[in-house]
């Protein structure tokens, strides 16, 4: 099949990095600049991806590849191939569309990116909290109230005053 | 082909002005929240302002309040920034860039920007 394909049709006989010219009488061209063909027998050659702005160049395109992006610093990528670029906020923060704002109280965030989470109610284990949460960090749950010696107590969290905060988007 | 070309930076003693276009070529802005943001030299990027598609939302970083405005004309397919009372650490490159499909509902990615245009505020 192979060889009959290649008799009826030259373009199959074009490698990758070059491409099947029609108007030289389906000669093998190389890419030009800035553009690639991944595999044989293509017709045209793409456009390399170009990073730039909030990209930066991963890979450069090559006669057989396409650039490779990721995102500049400040920014992390999403999407398959790093197809956009998130800004990165504080530990304590989640991004909104008027940029990053404080975890509201009772919640934390405790990395650069994604959204503020309630803190864990040891409550719902039958523990106590044992060491309490922040913007920043989980709280840490300990034994049960029950399973403390006498005399010793739990660490408890203070008054539920409202800190300045920010509702998610 | 899909592309943002920035253009309107200079120098500019501080306390002065500058407006920053961006023109949008391949897509249609009106669909899309548009953005700037900017690169001071040695430093991360950072996000600068957003507008949305009709230009009823506009939010900026802190640090440009009351100083900076973003605005748009889907009419000619372009974004503007105007900046006034510039400081020396408004100094940068600032690029333009759209908020990806979806951008504002789960997420606030960016998936296309310009080459940028450069910002020295120096005396």
């Known amino acids: 099949f192979e060889r009959t394909r290649s008799l009826q049709d030259p373009c199959s006989n074009c490698p990758a990095g070059t491409f099947c010219d029609n108007n030289r009488n389906q000669i093998c061209s190389p890419c030009p600049p800035n553009s690639f063909s991944s595999a044989g027998g293509q017709r045209t050659c793409d456009i390399c991806r170009q990073c730039k702005g909030v990209f930066r160049t991963r890979k450069e395109c090559s006669s057989t590849s396409n650039a490779e992006c990721d995102c500049t610093p400040g920014f992390h990528c999403l999407g398959a191939g790093c197809s956009m670029c998130e800004q990165d906020c504080k530990q304590g923060q989640e991004l909104t569309k008027k940029g990053c704002k404080d975890c509201c109280f009772g919640t934390f965030n405790d990395q650069k990116r994604g959204i503020c989470r309630p803190w864990t109610n040891c409550s719902l284990d039958g523990k106590s909290v044992l060491v309490n949460g922040t913007k920043e960090r989980d709280v840490v749950c300990g034994p049960s109230p029950a399973d403390l010696s006498p005399g010793a107590s739990s660490v408890t969290p203070p008054a539920p005053a409202r800190e300045p905060g920010h509702s998610p988007q | 082909q899909v592309q943002l070309v920035e253009s309107g930076g200079g120098l500019v003693q501080p306390g002065g002005s500058l407006r920053l276009s961006c023109a949008a070529t391949?897509?249609?802005?009106?669909n899309y929240w548009m953005n700037w943001v900017r690169q001071a030299p040695g430093k991360g990027l950072e996000w600068v302002a957003n507008i949305n598609q009709d230009g009823s939302e506009r939010y900026y970083v802190d640090s440009v309040k009351g100083r900076f405005t973003i605005s748009r004309d889907n009419a000619k397919n372009s974004l503007y920034l105007q900046m006034s009372s510039l400081r020396a650490e408004d100094t940068a490159v600032y690029f333009c860039?759209?908020?990806?499909?979806?951008?504002?509902?789960?997420?606030?990615?960016?998936?296309?920007s310009g080459q940028g245009t450069t910002v020295t505020v120096s005396s």
């Open positions: 391949g897509f249609t802005l009106s």
């Open positions: 860039a759209r908020g990806g499909e979806g951008y504002g509902v789960n997420h606030y990615g960016l998936d296309v």
